[in-house]
């Protein structure tokens, strides 16, 4: 509860709002309103948000802080940033996993689950785009492999194996018989 601020305060402005009887200075981010000011243009009594709660903006009427969200372990979420008095927990996916939105119109607050990223190497393909916000984008087959159906097949190591046209172009030789 501070002394009087500049008396020329405007109740319709950003810094002072009518709370109860008077036009009061709001509470800073990370604080909730314990009691409104007791004089015109005075400071409200503001207290720091308790642990596991937050308020992200300066506010005039919040008499309690919002509860920090818990990341959904069932959806394989992890906390990228822990909750503080001024910011909610930021949930995301651990390295090697990507966000799969649970709704079609995906925004930052949409529910999501984490999916393991495709391992292009295990599929014998080049990694074209690393997995982060969406799944890994795999490219062409690695050297020593050729496209066959949906996968990459290893070049034959002997002339006994069949080597269709694509194989020949990549593996560098054609079966002779």
């Amino acid at each position: 509860q501070g002394g009087t601020r500049s008396p020329r305060c405007d109740c319709a402005g950003d810094f002072h709002k009518k709370i109860g009887l008077f036009c009061c200075r709001g509470c800073p981010a990370g604080h909730y309103l314990k009691a409104p000011c007791t004089e015109p243009c005075g400071n409200s009594t503001c207290l720091v948000c308790p642990q596991d709660t937050f308020l992200a903006w300066e506010n005039h009427h919040n008499s309690e802080c919002a509860r920090c969200q818990a990341c959904d372990e069932q959806a394989s979420q992890v906390a990228l940033e822990n909750c503080s008095a001024v910011a909610d927990t930021r949930c995301g996916c651990k390295p090697g996993w990507f966000v799969e939105c649970q709704v079609s119109q995906c925004v930052s607050s949409s529910p999501f689950y984490c999916q393991p990223c495709l391992d292009c190497g295990a599929l014998h393909r080049h990694t074209r785009l690393l997995c982060s916000r969406r799944d890994t984008d795999c490219g062409t087959c690695l050297p020593g492999f050729y496209e066959h159906g949906d996968g990459c097949v290893s070049c034959p190591t002997s002339t006994l194996g069949s080597c269709p046209e694509r194989c020949a172009a990549v593996c560098g030789w054609r079966q002779m018989f």
């Epitope: 009087t4 008396p7 020329r8 109740c11 009518k18 709370i19 109860g20 009887l21 008077f22 036009c23 409104p36 007791t38 004089e39 015109p40 243009c41 005075g42 009427h61």
Partner: antibody, heavy 123, light 111 residues
Amino acid sequence: QVQLQQSGGGLVQPGGSLRLSCAASGFTFSSYAMSWVRQAPGKGLEWVATISDGDSYSYFPDSVKDRFTISRDNARNSLYLQMNSLRAEDTAVYYCARDRIYGSVQYYAMDYWGRGTLVTVSS
Amino acid sequence: DIVMTQSPDSLAVSLGERATINCRASESVEFSGTSLMQWYQQKPGQPPKLLIYAASNVESGVPDRFSGSGSGTDFTLTISSLQAEDVAVYYCQQSRKLPYTFGQGTKLEIK
């Protein structure tokens, strides 16, 4: 015309409770802050509680804080003072009053008063 | 808290004479160019009645023999020509900040 009709006073033992009421008429009750002021026998005036219009924030002096609560029912045009843990020094005539705000200065004066109700705290 | 001190505690004035009551605040009650203080009259057995607001504004319906003056911390209520019906206790009160506080009262009698 503005009228403030009070009720609920009486004799109560120390530690007891009492609820005072003030029925308002003749003005738009919900648009005004309202107060309670008391006067001990043969003594001066002491502010006891105020409740704001609109958001109904309440204010008390330290002498009654945590013992008294002020509330309002705008639908019934009524003001209340709930007094708990009463002490001998709470013995007084209790007045309800309308707080009129003047201009844009956030300045209030009690422009209409009820006739008062006597609260006696004694064993 | 702002302490309001009235003087004198009691006053006897002849009918038709001027009565002056003073009130001093322990700190300024000015805000934005206005003195946030008022004067009340309380007759025996009756509730207080608002006479003057913002130090010098006479409330509607109050006889014009009542006037108020002053600013900052020092204020005066003046009754220019005392009438029999003016016998009462007079209180000053500040609304500058909570808790609202009253002066101890000045008892005005006829000499």
